[in-house]
Interface confidence: low
């Protein structure tokens, strides 16, 4: 909190420019005018304010709005985006595209912070519903954000969003996602040549059906364990002991150590014993 | 199906400490996000703290920083939340809710939690 305290003759400030970085905070506090600040914000970030210049800056803006502050200054927030909290926060009406691409330009790069959530919900909240503009403006910054909405909300998910997610970032997508995210991946990649479709299609294979595995088991895609654990308990259930063993190409010795989990072991019991005798791994059906 | 059931809540002075337990059964696959949030009277449901399972990466609202610390145990799907130093302005409902969450920040904000416990109550005197 910084002391109330007259301005010093001759420095009011008429408008927000570079001389006030050589002002003290409380100079900041006395001579400059929280209405101006407000109309001048996009000045703000081509003046190399120090953080504890933003704090009394910030604090000028929370005294004038103390209610929330209206989107006319929270579009042009910049870097001072990065000095609310999510309770400064939550009292924003945000329901411009615009200012919410400002703002996540702003943290880009970092992973998403407690504001950056709230931000997206107050956005969320403020449209009423997930658009596809919106979902592909989150999907870009934040390509991961898909695995937090529901399977209701991916529906509204362009394929053009699917090029931008990384393996990591399915990590967190239950199986009722995938079986959103699979098909939209699937026409996203339809284009690719078969090795670079199946490093691309790969993470989302959670959602695929069996048809679409046993046309894989085809191509000699050598599937890791881990891609194959993930896989449809109903999808793998109808693959034949010829077709997993083409799936998973030199892999195939992996069922072994998973015999007792979930695909691998609702499998082995469909199998007839000769069929799984020919992998020569000891599996019991 | 998810059922979360929390223990642990009460009554105790300004300063004294309560640990809150929360069990989780049914299907986690994909819940990746466990934590609290409260609910004062007259006032909306706050995120408290968050972790992801797993990997033990946190989330705590600033209110609580220092305070509180978020623990699990993965074996037996429970989520803990140790509360030191209590103050007045803590006294609320409690809830423990499972979301989706790509990373652990993403716990603040109550739009995508999918499951919640019926709630415990801490009571903070001063």
């Known amino acids: 909190e910084v002391e109330k305290t007259a301005c010093p003759s001759g420095k009011k400030a008429r408008e927000i420019d570079e001389s006030l970085i050589f002002y003290k905070k409380w100079e900041l506090e006395a001579c400059v005018d929280a209405a101006l600040l407000a109309t001048q914000m996009d000045r703000v970030n081509a003046i190399p304010f120090t953080y504890e210049q933003l704090d009394v800056l910030k604090h000028k803006l929370d005294e004038l709005y103390p209610q929330g502050y209206p989107e006319s200054v929270i579009q042009h927030l910049g870097y001072l985006f990065l000095k609310m909290s999510p309770e400064d926060i939550r009292k924003w009406n945000v329901t411009s595209l615009e200012t919410l691409k400002a703002l996540l330009e702003v943290n880009k790069g970092h992973e998403m912070s407690p504001q950056v959530a709230t931000l997206i919900d107050r956005f969320v909240k403020g449209r009423g519903q997930l658009d596809k503009d919106t979902l592909d403006t989150l999907t870009a910054f934040y390509p991961g954000y898909l695995c937090s909405l529901s399977p209701e909300e991916l529906s509204s998910v362009p394929p053009s969003s699917i090029w931008a997610v990384r393996p990591q970032d399915l990590d967190t997508c239950d199986p009722r996602q995938l079986d959103v995210l699979y098909p939209k991946a699937r026409l996203a990649f339809q284009n690719m040549n078969g090795s670079e479709y199946f490093v691309k299609i790969q993470s989302f294979l959670g959602g695929a059906p069996t048809e679409d595995l046993k046309a894989l088991s085809q191509q000699n895609v050598s599937m890791d364990l881990a891609t194959f654990m993930k896989l449809r308990t109903d999808a793998v259930l109808p693959l034949t002991v010829a077709e997993v063993q083409k799936l998973l190409g030199p892999h195939v010795e992996g069922l072994k150590a998973e015999e007792r989990h979930r695909p691998v072991r609702d499998w082995i019991l469909r199998q007839r014993q000769d069929d799984l005798d020919t992998l020569g791994l000891g599996l019991q059906g | 199906q998810v059922h979360l059931v929390e223990s642990g809540g009460g009554s105790v002075q300004a300063g004294g400490s309560l640990r809150l337990s929360c069990a989780a059964s049914?299907?986690?696959?994909?819940?990746?996000?466990m934590g609290w949030f409260r609910q004062a009277p007259g006032k909306e449901r706050e995120a408290v703290a968050g972790?992801?399972?797993?990997?033990?990466?946190?989330y705590y609202a600033d209110s609580v920083k220092d305070r509180f610390t978020i623990s699990q145990d993965n074996a037996k799907n429970t989520v803990f939340l140790q509360m030191n130093s209590l103050k007045p302005e803590d006294t609320a409902m409690y809830y423990c809710?499972?979301?989706?969450?790509?990373?652990?920040?993403?716990?603040?904000?109550?739009?995508?939690?999918?499951?919640w416990g019926q709630g415990t109550q801490v009571t903070v005197s001063s």
């Open positions: 049914g299907d986690m696959n994909g819940y990746k996000c």
């Open positions: 972790i992801y399972t797993g990997r033990n990466t946190t």
């Open positions: 809710a499972s979301k989706y969450c790509a990373v652990v920040a993403e716990f603040g904000g109550p739009r995508l939690v999918r499951y």
